[in-house]
């Protein structure tokens, strides 16, 4: 059996503030059993955009529906883009574990940029 | 099996104070966040708290906030509701349910409530 | 705060009638809604989730469907253990709420 891989397919993603982003990632496979989250930046210092398993974000909606127990599609809509947003994405595979989920595997990650509105 | 049990209902003065309690066994309780849900006499469903499985979240109903806390301890596999200055309209049966993973999740498995008077 | 309103509040029918209970949200839940079935003196009885989906154990008969507003709960065919008090709840954002109940009576 294949491991599990987390792909973001889009490497660059240019949105105008106040219009929706929307980050793309797919899971190949339904195993390991765990949660997905995305972050902003990488290492100790990233910043937490959403965690499917826990908490309210009330900038983000997921594309599909993440309640349907087969599906493998985590990627998001951020509304609302500001220019503080910009910055790389990473979607994080984590795998249950106790106490606390294990980070299992991420995305290549996907830098988004923000372009000033209009005048 | 799962099973979700509540105590620590019964009868109360105003403006006193009650703690429930909803012991939880046949499932990892600490992948799961919970929730109160109650109901006052021939009345609907009422969404009292969530807590996230790690009580990183917590959310209160208007109705409650400011006199009602939520916890949980993951060790003992238990959720706790503690109700201070309660009033006449928190009569209720209180039911305790878990929820799987985040906030869009349904409320899989309810106890089988226990009753809160609220009566001088 | 997301209102939820279903309709009708009650219902008289027959064993073997199709049924149909509407629920309806003040703005989009998209497709965030769940329905759960309440017999007299017991605990809430998840059936569907998340507007179509079965929960397992849930007979076939019971369906679900809709998004954004507009969501059905259908009966194909009603059993005499079916008669009991619906709610749909959404959980698109907090505050969680239900709506008010469709009793379904016996005729």
């Known amino acids: 059996e294949e491991e599990l891989q987390v792909i973001q397919p889009d490497k660059f993603v240019l949105v105008a503030a106040g219009e929706t982003a929307t980050l793309r990632c797919t899971a190949t496979s339904l195993i390991p059993v765990g949660p997905i989250q995305w972050f902003r930046g990488a290492g100790p210092g990233r910043e937490l955009i959403y965690n499917q398993k826990e908490g309210h974000f009330p900038r983000v909606t997921t594309v599909s529906d993440l309640t349907k127990r087969n599906n493998m599609d985590f990627s998001i809509r951020i509304g609302n883009i500001t220019p503080a947003d910009a910055g790389t994405y990473y979607c994080v595979k984590f795998r249950k574990g106790s106490p606390d989920d294990v980070e299992f595997k991420s995305g290549a990650g996907t830098e988004l940029s923000v372009r000033a509105k209009p005048s | 099996q799962v099973q979700l049990v509540e105590s620590g209902g019964g009868v109360v003065q105003p403006g006193r104070s009650l703690r429930l309690s909803c012991a939880a066994s046949?499932?990892?309780?600490?992948?799961?966040?919970m929730i109160w849900v109650r109901q006052a006499p021939g009345k609907g469903l009422e969404w009292v708290a969530s807590?996230?499985?790690?009580?990183?979240?917590?959310y209160y109903a208007d109705s409650v906030k400011g006199r009602f806390t939520i916890s949980r301890d993951n060790s003992k596999n238990r959720l706790y509701l503690q109700m201070n200055s309660l009033r006449a309209e928190d009569t209720a049966v209180y039911y305790c349910?878990?929820?799987?993973?985040?906030?869009?999740?349904?409320?899989?498995?309810w106890g089988q409530g226990t009753m809160v008077t609220v009566s001088s | 705060d997301t209102q939820l309103t279903q309709s009708p509040s009650s219902l008289s029918a027959s064993v073997g009638q199709r049924v149909t209970i509407t629920c309806g949200a003040s703005?989009?839940?998209?497709?965030?809604m769940h329905w759960y079935q309440q017999k007299p003196g017991k605990q809430p009885k998840l059936l569907i989730y998340?507007?179509?989906n079965l929960e397992a154990g849930v007979p076939s008969r019971f369906s679900g469907s809709g998004s954004g507003t507009d969501f059905t709960l259908t009966i194909s065919s009603l059993q005499p253990e079916d008669f009991a008090t619906y709610y749909c709840?959404?959980?698109?954002?907090?505050?969680?709420?239900f709506g008010q109940g469709t009793k379904l009576e016996i005729k």
């Open positions: 709840q959404q959980s698109n954002e907090p505050p969680y709420t």
């Open positions: 703005k989009s839940v998209r497709t965030y």
């Open positions: 998340s507007a179509s």
């Open positions: 807590i996230s499985s790690s009580s990183s979240y917590i």
């Open positions: 349910a878990r929820r799987y993973y985040g906030f869009n999740y349904p409320f899989d498995y």
């Open positions: 046949g499932f990892t309780f600490s992948d799961y966040g």
